[in-house]
Interface confidence: low
């Protein structure tokens, strides 16, 4: 059964202190066989018992193993059905807790009733606050039966359910007519799918004989042990305050498990923890009683004393549930309660026994679930014990189940049942996944979904070149880590397969499906050389480089130029996607910045060696644009430009640059320097007649500044075509009329 416990804290004086906690002891709770599985769910189930809406309950998770529900504000919030769901896949299990109001008119004598198929179930509702009206019984929220109020026996209303069947399972309630449903007595009836002591399809298999109040699961024959007991047959008591299938959990708080109700997977239901009883699980067991709800009686013999948590504590020389077995009766020693083997293995199982007379080889036998008896092949006889070794024939899945080691001597006999789990070695359902590749290595994620059983102990990756008949190379890796296949050939396809293993002999599964993974191209080896660079503006840089001449084709797809701005700690990368390129224009750079520059050849995702770096200082940015640029035609070949100096100059202007371009023309523009920076006017001569021109200008201090607005003007008349524009400057004060 799934190791899932729902704990209810029954300190009911203050609903705000009430909480429900669901604890999973499953290995990797919330984890499926190959990936994160569904989490624990804990919720109030309002389908049958509806309560007035209140503030939402608070859910707090403690890892994937525990979830707690708090935030109850009033007693009515507590009444009803709560459920916890845990486990993955086919093992997904729901645990149910039914909460009754302590102030209800009717209270259940016992909330959880677990009965066998065909039994008679009797639900008993005790009168707590009498009302002289009929009592309505409901099953799963639907009307079921009515009792007249005179029919109470000893202050109890009884509902008898003869010959119950599994569909009769569910939530039952007893309510006074016209009373609030919150004052009902709520019960939970669990009907096992088989008669007493039987389990399995057709109920043909015999239960192991669960001890200490454990209940045999009708599907798998396992004992669902009460809180505080463990072992295949619940034969072992946990120490006080412990619960869970391996006693691995501990009750919270200083008073141990006092005041806690424990709910376990069906068909167990709910009870107090070991050593406690009462409707609120706050009363210790009476002398001579022990276990969950104090339902068990000690009846210790031979001087044994009764411990309310674990039962009889035997004096030296005695053992057994009631201290009824003398240490001289043969005793099987330290037999594991559960063993795990892999399918088709032939394990050796050891069974050690002591006693007087001393057990010999022939007195110890091993019985399989199908009744086959195995005799030991050898025995190791020591002064204090005999260990018989059994060679088990090749295991099949049907060998899963309860095996039994039995020792018989004239002093008596002892037997110990233990569970054998036959596990199927895991087989990958998918191929491994390629994460990254280089020219000589592949990084692979090996763990994929698989059939068969976990946990995965080792992952073997088999690989070889595609279409090769050479032996497979194998690498053993940790299941949780990605693996790097090294020393591969560049640009080569490899067939890669995964083989999974689980713990134990014969745990290796079959190989999974192959996948093709191809290594990257070879890394480039040539180191470029920076031939030169040229500043084309405050934010533009032209770079040129060369490569050494080598025989054969060039191994490369292009070049990566890197500019490092050490002041700002920024790197600029420029990709030149042609391997034939030997020059590049870098734009959008920061004026006045000192850059370190290098270039590398790249091939696929691999970078070759970087060139020796160059250090480049870009000039600072220039001044603002000249203002109010104006163009005025003077003749068929002359146009006068006038402007105002830029504002907020960072320094003295060294010159102005005028750009002249024929409007709509396809040719390059012409740049003309005005070398007398104090002037605010110039005449551009040598223009063509009746031609529209575009002009703009900028100032220069250390670097060229921003362009002004563009102005347009046409030359006059139909004069002769000029040689080309030239310039003559004068100060604006001279004016055109002089």
């Amino acid at each position: 059964a799934v190791d899932l416990t729902l704990l209810a804290n029954l300190r009911l004086t203050d609903p705000q202190r009430f909480f429900l906690t669901c604890v999973s002891g499953e290995a990797g709770a919330g984890r499926g066989s190959d990936a994160w599985g569904p989490p624990l769910l804990l919720e109030k189930d309002d389908r049958i018992v509806r309560t007035p809406p209140g503030p939402p309950l608070r859910l707090a998770r403690n890892g994937s193993h525990q979830v707690t529900l708090r935030g109850f504000s009033k007693p009515s919030d507590l009444v009803g059905v709560f459920s916890c769901v845990g486990g993955a896949g086919a093992r997904r299990t729901r645990v149910i807790y039914v909460h009754n109001s302590p102030g209800a008119h009717l209270l259940p004598d016992k909330v959880t009733h677990t009965v066998n198929k065909g039994d008679t179930a009797v639900l008993s509702a005790r009168v707590h606050k009498e009302k002289q009206t009929d009592v309505i019984w409901k099953s799963n929220g639907s009307y079921f039966y009515t009792l007249d109020w005179h029919e109470a026996q000893d202050g109890r209303f009884l509902l008898q359910l003869p010959n119950v069947q599994p569909p009769s399972s569910g939530i039952y309630s007893a309510t006074y007519l016209e009373a609030s449903p919150l004052g009902s007595a709520f019960f939970r009836l669990i009907v096992r799918g088989c008669g007493a002591g039987r389990w399995g399809p057709g109920c043909t298999k015999e239960c192991p004989g669960c001890l200490h109040g454990g209940v045999c699961h009708d599907h798998d024959g396992e004992c669902v042990c009460p809180p505080g007991f463990t072992g295949t047959r619940c034969e072992q008591a946990c120490r006080e305050g412990r619960f869970g299938q391996s006693c691995q959990e501990q009750c919270p708080g200083i008073s141990g498990c006092r005041g806690l109700t424990f709910c376990l997977p069906d068909p167990y239901g709910c009870s107090c923890g070991s050593g406690w009883r009462g409707s609120q699980c706050q009363e210790a067991c009476a002398p001579g009683h022990f276990g969950a709800d104090c339902r068990l009686q000690c009846q210790c013999q031979n001087g044994g004393t009764c411990d309310r948590f674990s039962g009889c504590v035997c004096p030296s020389g005695w053992h057994g549930v009631h201290c009824e077995k003398s240490d001289r009766i043969p005793q099987i020693l330290n037999m594991a309660s559960e063993l795990e083997f892999n399918l088709e293995t032939m394990p050796r199982i050891n069974c050690a026994a002591a006693g007087n007379p001393f057990p010999v080889r022939g007195s110890i036998e091993l019985r399989k679930p199908d009744g086959t008896v195995l005799l030991s092949t050898k025995a190791i006889v020591e002064p204090e014990k005999t260990t018989a070794e059994f060679e088990v024939p090749r295991l099949v899945l049907a060998d899963s189940g309860f095996w039994e080691c039995r020792v018989s001597t004239s002093g008596g006999q002892d037997s110990r049942r233990f569970k054998v789990n036959v596990k199927v070695p895991p087989v990958p359902l998918a191929a491994p996944r390629l994460l990254t590749k280089q020219s000589r290595q592949l990084v692979v994620s090996p763990l994929v979904s698989f059939s068969g059983d976990g946990p995965i102990s080792t992952v073997r990756l088999h690989y070889r070149p595609q279409d090769s008949t050479m032996d497979w190379s194998t690498i053993v890796v940790d299941p949780s880590e990605n693996v790097t296949l090294m020393n591969l050939r560049p640009k080569t396809g490899y067939s890669v397969r995964v083989q999974l293993s689980r713990p134990g002999e014969g745990g290796e599964g079959a190989w999974g499906p192959p996948t093709l993974m191809t290594t990257d191209c070879p890394e480039p080896l040539l180191q470029p050389w920076l031939e030169g660079w040229h500043v084309e503006g405050t934010d533009r840089l032209r770079v040129s480089w060369s490569l050494p001449l080598v025989p054969g084709p060039l191994v490369g797809d292009g070049f990566l130029l890197r500019l490092w701005d050490g002041t700002r700690g920024q790197e600029r990368r420029e990709n030149v996607s042609s391997p034939q390129a030997r020059t590049a224009l870098l734009t959008g750079l920061t004026p006045g910045t000192h850059y370190q520059l290098d270039v590398q050849l790249y091939h696929c995702t691999l970078l070759g060696p970087a060139s020796p770096p160059a250090h480049v200082l870009l000039p600072p940015s220039g001044p603002p644009a000249p203002r109010h640029l104006h163009a005025q035609a003077l003749s068929d070949s002359e146009i006068q430009l006038t402007w105002k100096h830029p504002e907020a100059l960072p320094g003295p202007i060294s010159k102005y640059v005028v750009e002249v371009q024929v409007a709509g023309g396809a040719g390059d523009p012409l740049w003309i320097d005005v070398d007398r920076p104090e002037e605010t006017s110039t005449i551009i001569r040598g223009l063509n007649a009746s031609t529209r021109y575009l002009f703009r200008m900028r100032a220069s201090i250390q670097g060229l500044g921003d362009w002004s607005n563009t102005v347009e003007e046409s030359t006059l008349g139909n004069g002769l075509q000029a040689e080309g524009p030239v310039q003559e400057s004068r100060a604006a004060e001279e004016g055109l009329d002089q």
């Epitope: 504590v313 030296s316 020389g317 053992h319 020693l333 204090e384």
Partner: antibody, heavy 121, light 109 residues
């Protein structure tokens, strides 16, 4: 508080005898499998002996078999190790230990502080 | 000569992940689980990992155990200076005898 307290160690000549005791408190001693484990100076741990709760079964390492005897008195909550024919290689800190929490067989979660046994002429 | 084999020493820097191996044979590792102990200088051993990979309450989740066939390993991630100690692996053999490794000294550099 759960506690194991060893005593009885000391200096003894080769061939001599010594009896170690281990007093248990804070748990139901009579229900637990008990162990002696030793550690020679600068060396690893070595399992010496174990005894079942009733005292009905005892186990010994090959290196001490026939020379050492483990026993217990459940009424006194005490574990003993009678060591005879002592040798120089028996020099070690001797710990008593138990697996109180029902973990796996080799998982001893309660240990004493140890008692030193020196075998030297 | 210890029955289980461990490296005499390992070392690591704070924050690093280190692993300690422990190998045995079919008699002791075959159907029995592995336990790991931490022993600080001058003190008794402390249970660290049981049943191959389970941690008792109070042991940080930086410590993890795994095993396959006849070898086991203890991994310590996010190494801290207080992890400097001797680490011992242990198991039970098929004759119901306890077996230990020789111990591994972990040094935090």
């Amino acid at each position: 508080e759960v506690q194991l307290l060893e005593s009885g160690g000391g200096l003894v000549q080769p061939g001599g005898s010594l009896r170690l005791s281990c007093a248990a408190s804070g748990f139901t001693f009579s229900q637990y499998l008990m162990q002696w484990v030793r550690q020679a100076p600068g060396k690893g741990l070595e399992w010496v002996s174990s005894i079942y709760p009733s005292g009905g079964a005892t186990y010994y390492a090959d290196s001490v078999k026939g020379r050492f005897t483990i026993s217990r008195d459940n009424s006194k909550n005490t574990l003993y190790l009678q060591m005879n024919s002592l040798r120089a290689e028996d020099t070690a800190v001797y710990y008593c230990a138990t697996r109180k929490d029902g973990y796996s067989r080799s998982a001893f979660d309660i240990w004493g502080q140890g008692t030193m046994v020196t075998v030297s002429s | 000569q210890s029955v289980l084999t461990q490296p005499p020493s390992v070392s690591g820097i704070p924050g690093q992940r280190v692993t300690i191996s422990c190998s045995g044979n079919n008699s002791n590792f075959g159907s029995n689980t592995v336990t790991w102990y931490q022993q600080l200088p001058g003190t008794a051993p402390k249970l660290l990992i049981y049943s191959d990979s389970r941690r008792p309450s109070g042991v940080p989740d930086r410590f993890s155990g795994s095993r396959s066939d006849t070898s086991a390993s203890l991994a310590i991630s996010g190494l801290q200076s207080e992890d400097e100690a001797e680490y011992h692996c242990a198991a039970w053999d098929d004759s119901l005898n306890g077996v230990f490794g020789g111990g591994t000294k972990l040094t935090v550099l």
